[in-house]
Interface confidence: medium
């Protein structure tokens, strides 16, 4: 051929037209061309229809061609690989109808700022998708639904700040995920699903270490040997895993997998995400309960006492173990008080007046003071119905989970909790007038009701707040029957789900510290 090099290897006819200053497809290329290289030309725009005569074309390289537009018309029925990298495309062409057999699509280093929901529709054979080095900020939730055979996905070096929770749903063959060098601050719960992901690249993101990160932390712990640092030019299989490369941005580059997360509810591990419940692992010494460790659980119903200490906090960061460097959108709160003010390790708390009634009592609740939101049992956010459940029942007692095995195993997503947990012995009766209370918005600070046993000797009991403690003595709610040793229990008020989508508001309800 006068312009391009033609070579035949086995059954492949390869035509190399790289670096020829071409502005269009050269004429008279061999009709049985299977691999066509058009890299580093000045095509600017290109129509795939011009390639329709080449019915055996399986690979097309259009990288570094200053492409601003790719016209998709006609059909290239056997084209398997399309390289569009290092161009100037601002939108991803809808390739599904034109390239039904496509298995590898590389659109790295273009100028994509967003992808439409149906961007990959019709690409059911796609196995590798490379979108590295674009300007993507978000992704549509069902983006990868049409590509169930996907094995490799690169979203590295974009401006992604968040990922849709179900992005990887159904991608059972996915073995490599490149998310490094983005602006991700958290990974949504359940994001990785239950299938094994052998190669994950997650470094170079400003991970915000607070309670919202716990699902991701747990996944990192269980998949430590599958987390790698990207090295240009090194084969993935030759790289060494490095889970410590995933670091907290707000805490001195602390590895996320070691983030202590003290006082957080077990968002990463538990199905119920409605209320706090504290179950200390106990050593009994006479009539004292010595709390040595705390596992934080979520029952689906409230249980509180006729006596209560209320306190609330602002929505700024309460991640008090790392107060010195906050996320850019978070503000530092100056006022911090411990709760109770002098509650320190090995302090014995005597509260003679507190009694736990063995029989549940149903009492109406007085109107709370304007500064606090009314305590209302909220539904667990992962339930299908989101209506408030006005009748509290006694949750099933939960003991501390068994330690995880040392060998990591895929973390399967827990099944959604039933609407009503199995009651122990007697359920508490419904209030006389069950009226669903409007769910507070983000503007309302969450409020916590904490009740205590008559005698607790905690090893460590810090509760950090950012507003002064206030005591609402008249507050009453039902007490479920206690069939276990006395425990410190707490109820989180305020609608957890309402701020779940705002990562800078919701995560900071976390910082009740462990016993």
């Amino acid at each position: 051929h006068p312009i391009c090099e033609v070579s035949k290897v086995a059954s492949h006819l390869e035509v190399n037209c790289d670096k020829r200053n071409l502005t269009a497809l050269p004429p008279d290329l061999p009709k049985d061309t299977t691999i066509l290289h058009l890299s580093e030309n000045l095509l600017y725009t290109f129509s795939l229809a011009t390639l329709m005569p080449y019915t055996r074309l399986t690979q097309l390289n259009l990288d570094r061609c200053e492409l601003t537009k790719l016209q998709v018309d006609g059909t290239l029925p056997v084209l398997g690989t399309l390289d569009l990298s290092h161009n100037q495309l601002q939108s991803l062409p809808l390739l599904g109808q034109t390239l039904p057999a496509l298995t590898v699509l590389d659109v790295s280093f273009n100028r994509l700022t967003s992808l439409p929901l149906g961007a990959l529709r019709g690409l059911g054979e796609l196995q590798e998708l490379y979108l590295k080095g674009n300007e993507l900020k978000t992704l549509p939730p069902g983006l990868l639904t049409p590509t169930p055979k996907l094995e490799k996905l690169s979203l590295a070096n974009n401006n992604l700040t968040e990922l849709p929770a179900g992005l990887l749903n159904g991608l059972e063959n996915l073995d490599t995920l490149l998310l490094q060098e983005n602006s991700l601050y958290t990974i949504p719960k359940g994001f990785f699903g239950s299938h094994l992901l052998p190669f994950a690249f997650l470094h170079g993101n400003p991970w915000l270490c607070n309670c919202e990160i716990l699902y991701f932390r747990r996944w990192l712990q269980d998949n430590a040997e599958n987390v790698y640092v990207w090295k240009q030019g090194v084969d993935v299989k030759a790289m060494t895993s490095n889970v410590a490369s995933v670091q907290c941005d707000n805490s001195d580059k602390f590895p996320v997998y070691k983030y202590p997360g003290k006082g957080c509810p077990t968002l990463g591990d538990e199905g119920d995400t409605d209320l706090y419940d504290y179950y200390p692992e106990e050593d009994t010494e006479g009539d004292k309960v010595r709390a040595t460790r705390t596992v934080v659980k979520f029952p689906t119903k409230a249980h509180t006492t006729p006596w209560g200490l209320f306190y609330s906090w602002s929505t700024a960061s309460l991640d008090s173990q790392m107060p010195s460097s906050l996320h850019p959108t978070q503000e530092s709160t100056k006022e911090q008080t411990t709760f109770p003010p002098r509650w320190t390790p090995n302090f014995t708390l005597h509260m003679e007046s507190i009694t736990f009634s063995k029989t549940p009592k149903s009492t109406t609740e007085p109107t709370p003071s304007p500064t606090t939101s009314e305590p209302v049992p909220e539904p667990a956010p992962n339930m299908t119905t989101l209506e408030p459940t006005p009748s509290p029942t006694t949750p099933e007692p939960t003991s501390e989970p068994a330690p995880s095995p040392t060998t990591p195993e895929p973390t399967s997503e827990p099944a959604p909790s039933p609407t009503t947990p199995e009651p122990t012995s007697e359920p508490a009766p419904s209030p006389t007038t069950p009226e669903p209370t409007p769910i507070p918005t983000i503007a309302t600070s969450p409020t916590i009701l904490v009740s205590a046993t008559s005698l607790i000797t905690p090893k460590s009991t810090f509760l950090t707040t950012t507003k002064p403690v206030s005591l609402l003595e008249s507050t009453k709610k039902t007490i479920p029957e206690l069939d276990q040793p006395p425990k410190l229990r707490g109820v989180l008020q305020g609608h957890l789900e309402s701020s779940r989508n705002d990562p800078f508001l919701h995560p900071d309800f976390c910082c009740l510290l462990p016993l």
Epitope: K262, R293, T294, P403
Partner: nanobody, 121 residues
Framework: EVQLVESGGGLVQPGGSLRLSCAAS????????MYWVRQAPGKGLEWVSA????????YYADSVKGRFTISRDNAKNTLYLQMNSLKSEDTAVYYC??????????????WGQGTQVTVSS
């Protein structure tokens, strides 16, 4: 039984130094990350520093970076915190804390009783 016993606290003038120690027993010290945390009077709990199992990786809160050094001696089952250029805002009870035994639990696993550090002229 797991025990963490801090020592080395005391009264020191601004700009002075202290070295805190934490003697650990009842668990395989060399298998756990260890942490120093502190609580200033009337303030919340603040994470100060952390060290990995072998001592090769150390982490510090911004407020102490460049002034404090965490280290460990796995042969002696002891954790240390060298505090230099102390400021009045470093006044607090300092606790050493053991890492989690597994990923199902959350929070520091065990704490010492704390040692008081007072920086005052």
């Amino acid at each position: 039984e797991v025990q963490l016993v801090e020592s080395g606290g005391g009264l020191v003038q601004p700009g002075g130094s202290l070295r805190l120690s934490c003697a650990a027993s009842g668990f395989t010290f060399s298998s756990y990350w260890m942490y120093w945390v502190r609580q200033a009077p009337g303030k919340g709990l603040e994470w100060v520093s952390a060290i990995n199992t072998g001592g090769g990786s150390t982490y510090y809160a911004d407020s102490v970076k460049g002034r404090f050094t965490i280290s460990r001696d796995n042969a002696k089952n002891t954790l240390y915190l060298q505090m230099n250029s102390l400021k009045s805002e470093d006044t607090a009870v300092y606790y050493c804390a053991k890492d989690l035994p597994n990923s199902d639990s959350l929070g520091y696993d065990y704490w010492g009783q704390g040692t008081q550090v007072t920086v005052s002229s």
